[in-house]
């Protein structure tokens, strides 16, 4: 019962995680304009993996897709690739795990096959989650680097009084969605791997049978056979370390009802 619950919960958590990874990948707010000392802005810029947008205070929002492949930064391409790989692996993992669920009966599928499928989907979820976390972390690192670079030359003087304000970008909502979603997928994958161990039949013990020969009283006791599942109780649990970059919590300041500029 506990195994079924662990497997079911692992599936649900992974499903939510993968939905989150898909949502994060599609979101436009991977990076948003840093409002630093100006919480109210007439022109608000934000960017996603696929397009950049500008929201004007007048009510108009204009989004433009990145219609070039070669002209994009390699890091952005890498993040796109990581997120897509994460989605694909996660989707395959979900498909496999549906058939592996203990509560679903498909023909005469043995528990050993279900255990194998559960482990496979679990590993896929773990890799999917790691891909998402890695993708989001790479993007976040890229933002932090650019943020400090643009801070260094925040105001470039032109003829004394004229100023050019450089737009700085900070973490967008998609990053947090991606981190959480990646974490959930990872946790779901670990739960599937744990459930797999419970699904695998450990050993089959045959009760001793006595055969009475007519002349001699000889008892024949066949030895207990261990089912060869490949998932013995000696399987070591390897710790998976997440080396994702950590940043201080950022306080997003939103425009209040009455802003004076």
């Amino acid at each position: 019962m506990a195994v079924t619950a662990c497997q079911g919960l692992g599936f649900v958590v992974s499903l939510i995680g993968i939905a989150g990874i898909i949502a994060a990948t599609c979101m436009d707010q991977w990076s948003t304009q840093d409002l630093y000392n100006n919480p109210v802005t007439a022109v608000f810029n934000y960017q996603g993996l696929w397009r950049s947008c500008v929201r004007e205070s007048s009510g108009f929002t204009e989004c433009r897709g990145y219609f070039t492949l070669l002209g994009l930064p390699a890091m952005l391409q890498a993040v796109r690739a990581l997120m897509i790989v994460g989605i694909v692996l996660g989707a395959i993992g979900l498909l496999v795990s549906i058939f592996a669920l203990k509560c679903i009966r498909i023909g005469s599928m043995e528990d050993s096959a279900k255990a194998n499928m559960t482990l496979t989907s679990g590993i896929m979820f773990i890799v999917s989650g790691l891909c998402a976390i890695a993708g989001v972390s790479v993007f976040a690192n890229m933002l932090v680097t650019n943020f400090w670079m643009s801070t260094a030359n925040m105001y470039t003087g032109m003829g004394g009084m004229v100023q050019t304000v450089q737009t700085r970008y900070t973490f967008g909502a998609a990053l947090f969605v991606g981190w959480v979603a990646g974490g959930l997928t990872l946790i779901g994958g670990v739960m599937m791997c744990i459930a797999c161990r419970g699904l695998a039949p450990e050993e089959t013990n045959y009760k001793a049978v006595s055969y009475h020969a007519s002349g001699h009283s000889v008892a024949y006791k066949p030895g207990g056979f261990k089912a060869s599942t490949g998932f013995g109780s000696n399987t070591k649990n390897k710790k998976i370390y997440d080396g994702g970059a950590r940043t201080e919590d950022e306080v997003q300041s939103y425009p209040s009802k009455h802003d004076y500029v």
């Epitope: 304009q33 004007e56 205070s57 007048s58 108009f60 004229v162 802003d259 500029v261």
Partner: antibody
């Protein structure tokens, strides 16, 4: 077509308050901001503030802090501006304007003349 | 606040002449997000509300004659009337739409000789 119909001229005494209205029609009212602009006779234009009808968010010019307050009634698609503690300096034509691309003002009301006189 | 400075303050022209008026901002009006300049031009005739001519520094508002052309980037902008006509006599204002508070130039008054 987009129309902004403003209330009629006002003659008020110094120290009093006045409420100007701006009735919008011909477009989705909550999708665009409403701005208010002041123009003194024979002078330039001064932006007072803006209101975004969808969430009621307001942004004011610091120069008009305490002088003007913007409100909205989405059910009647009408925007209001209250002007407080009026002085002769507040005698002007006040325009309500709908925002457009580039934070420009494409649609202007006909203007309301406010005269502050004892 | 961004200060908008228009020059000249008044301009006397003859019919069918080419007119150039300038607007300078104290800060760049260029937005890197969409590569656009948030500068607007208006025309105001006596006793009327201002009329939008140009937004995003160079995009002509629908219904505006093509003799009106906006140009410039960053802090320096120009409104050109290729062949001025009698109905163009008015005051022309430029406006910053890049940051709050929105600010207007003092205006350029176009007069006929």
């Amino acid at each position: 077509q987009v129309q902004l119909q403003q209330s009629g001229p006002e003659l008020v005494k110094p120290g009093a308050s006045v409420k100007l209205s701006c009735k919008a029609s011909g477009y989705s009212f909550t999708n665009f901001d409403i701005n208010w602009v002041k123009q003194r006779p024979g002078q330039g234009l001064q932006w007072i503030g803006r209101l975004y009808p969808r969430d009621g968010t307001t942004t004011y010019n610091e120069k008009f802090k305490g002088k003007a307050s913007l409100t909205v009634d989405t059910s009647s698609t009408t925007s209001y501006m209250d002007l407080h503690s009026l002085t002769s300096e507040d005698s002007a034509v006040y325009f309500c304007v709908r925002g457009n691309y580039g934070n420009s003002f494409a649609y202007w009301g006909q203007g309301t003349l406010v005269t502050v006189s004892a | 606040d961004i200060v908008m400075t228009q020059s000249p303050s008044s301009l006397t022209v003859t019919a069918r002449e080419k007119v150039i008026m300038n607007c300078k901002s104290s800060q760049s009006l260029f937005n890197s997000g969409n590569q656009k300049n948030y500068l607007t031009w208006y025309q105001q005739k006596p006793g009327q509300s201002p009329k939008l001519l140009i937004y995003w520094a160079s995009t002509r508002q629908s219904g505006v004659p093509d003799r009106f052309t906006g140009s410039g980037s960053g802090t320096d902008f120009t409104l050109t009337i290729s062949t001025v006509q009698a109905e163009d006599l008015a005051v022309y204002f430029c406006q910053n739409g890049f940051s709050f508070p929105y600010t207007f130039g003092g205006g350029t008054k176009l007069e006929m000789n």
